[in-house]
């Protein structure tokens, strides 16, 4: 946020940039939280735009019985590993095909025991305030589907009729990690010492980090003809004086006619 300065007064302005503002030769360059010629004003809204998507990662282990383990499978650059990865990925894409949040799988390790496959199932959803519920539901469906396939696709007489067969007892969910996004926490942090006065309000499922000085929200402070200004003690209305009236009161709603004051009379609207 920048305010340009022209003329002789600029040199004085340079030394007066407030709130961590820096002089760039023309103007005060203000930190995110401030604006104004001297960075003296506190912004009324902070961009905490959520990520477009939120991700989750499930650490799973399955045991593949239709492939015999060889040492080459430990080497991720070997042809054996690459072919295994291709088949395993295709198989898992089929298993999870009905889950809109499913992105893919990532094999982390192959080890002996038929072939024990340590892998991550990757999930992603568009950000909405309900993203946690969406991803929680998706992880439950992943568990159901992998349990089902590893129970159904099994070897019979040492032969597999499916793309891959599994050991029913070898399926485990180790860990589930969901990318954390907390707009309230982000808002508080970014508002720094004004954190107590900034709140998150939603519009079209998007979070906005605003102070009561931002118009158009349920917490907005109506200063009438005055100007809302944030201070360390909270939002305050700075009342204006017109040619005919002085305005006062917490929300600048009390108008005093100048002519009546000069005539030693008070009149409130």
């Amino acid at each position: 946020r920048t305010t340009t300065c022209f003329g002789d007064g600029c040199q004085n302005t340079a030394s007066r940039c407030k709130n961590g503002g820096t002089w760039d030769g023309l103007k005060c360059q203000c930190p995110n939280l401030y604006y104004g010629e001297l960075c003296e004003e506190v912004v009324s809204s902070i961009d905490i735009g959520p990520p477009e998507t939120i991700s989750a990662q499930m650490e799973l282990t399955v045991t593949v019985t239709s492939v015999k383990f060889t040492e080459e499978l430990k080497n991720h650059s070997s042809q054996e590993f690459q072919e295994f990865k291709q088949t395993f990925t295709e198989q898992m894409n089929i298993v999870y095909s009905g889950i809109p949040e499913y992105v893919g799988v990532n094999i982390t390790k192959l080890r002996l025991g038929s072939v024990v496959v340590e892998h991550d199932v990757l999930l992603r959803t568009k950000y909405t305030p309900e993203y946690k519920t969406v991803l929680d539901n998706a992880t439950e469906v992943v568990k159901e589907k992998i349990t089902k396939v590893t129970t159904q696709q099994i070897m019979i007489n040492d032969i597999c009729s499916d793309m891959m067969c599994f050991n029913t007892t070898g399926t485990q969910v180790q860990n589930i990690t969901v990318t954390q996004y907390d707009p309230e926490e982000d808002c508080r942090k970014m508002a720094k010492e004004y954190g107590d006065y900034f709140v998150v309000e939603y519009r079209d499922q998007k979070p906005y980090c605003i102070s009561p000085c931002e118009p158009g929200f349920s917490v907005s402070k109506n200063c009438n003809l005055g100007k809302c200004q944030m201070s360390l003690s909270g939002p305050q209305c700075l009342c204006v004086t017109t040619e005919t009236h002085w305005y006062s009161g917490e929300t600048c709603n009390q108008g005093t006619q100048k002519s009546l004051v000069y005539g030693h009379h008070h009149h409130h609207h």
Epitope: E83, T87, M155, C160
Partner: nanobody
């Protein structure tokens, strides 16, 4: 990349014999799994005979005792000896390979394929 080229197909009378060959390029012939699959018109591709580098072999019930799978590592060649051929053996025969030691009949698990050779059993 493994390349497979089949040969030996043709027309034969019921009860006759054919020997299919599959020549492989690349240095992977001595490891992994090799097999013969077939696909008759209007039907799905099915496993006929499979062999793995650990000595495991498989034959479809319909060919047991009539077909024999073998390989010559020095020539990088896979064979399918087919005896006592029947009309129902008519199909396109495909050679397949994988560097993995497989135990699956499902064609989707096999990574490398030849172009196929036609076998017709007819009187």
């Amino acid at each position: 990349e493994v390349q497979l080229v089949e040969s030996g197909g043709g027309v034969v009378q019921p009860g006759g014999s054919l020997r299919l060959s599959c020549a492989a390029s690349g240095d992977t012939f001595s490891r992994g799994s090799w097999g013969w699959f077939r696909q008759a018109p209007g039907k799905e591709r099915e496993a006929v005979a499979l062999i793995s580098s650990d000595g495991w072999t498989f034959y479809a019930d319909s060919v047991k005792g009539r077909f024999t799978i073998s390989q010559d590592n020095s020539k990088n060649t896979l064979y399918l000896q087919m005896n006592s051929l029947r009309a129902e053996d008519t199909a396109v025969y495909y050679c397949a390979a994988s560097v993995l030691v497989l135990r699956t009949l499902n064609p989707k698990a096999w990574h490398h394929w030849g172009q196929g050779t036609m076998v017709t059993v007819s009187s």
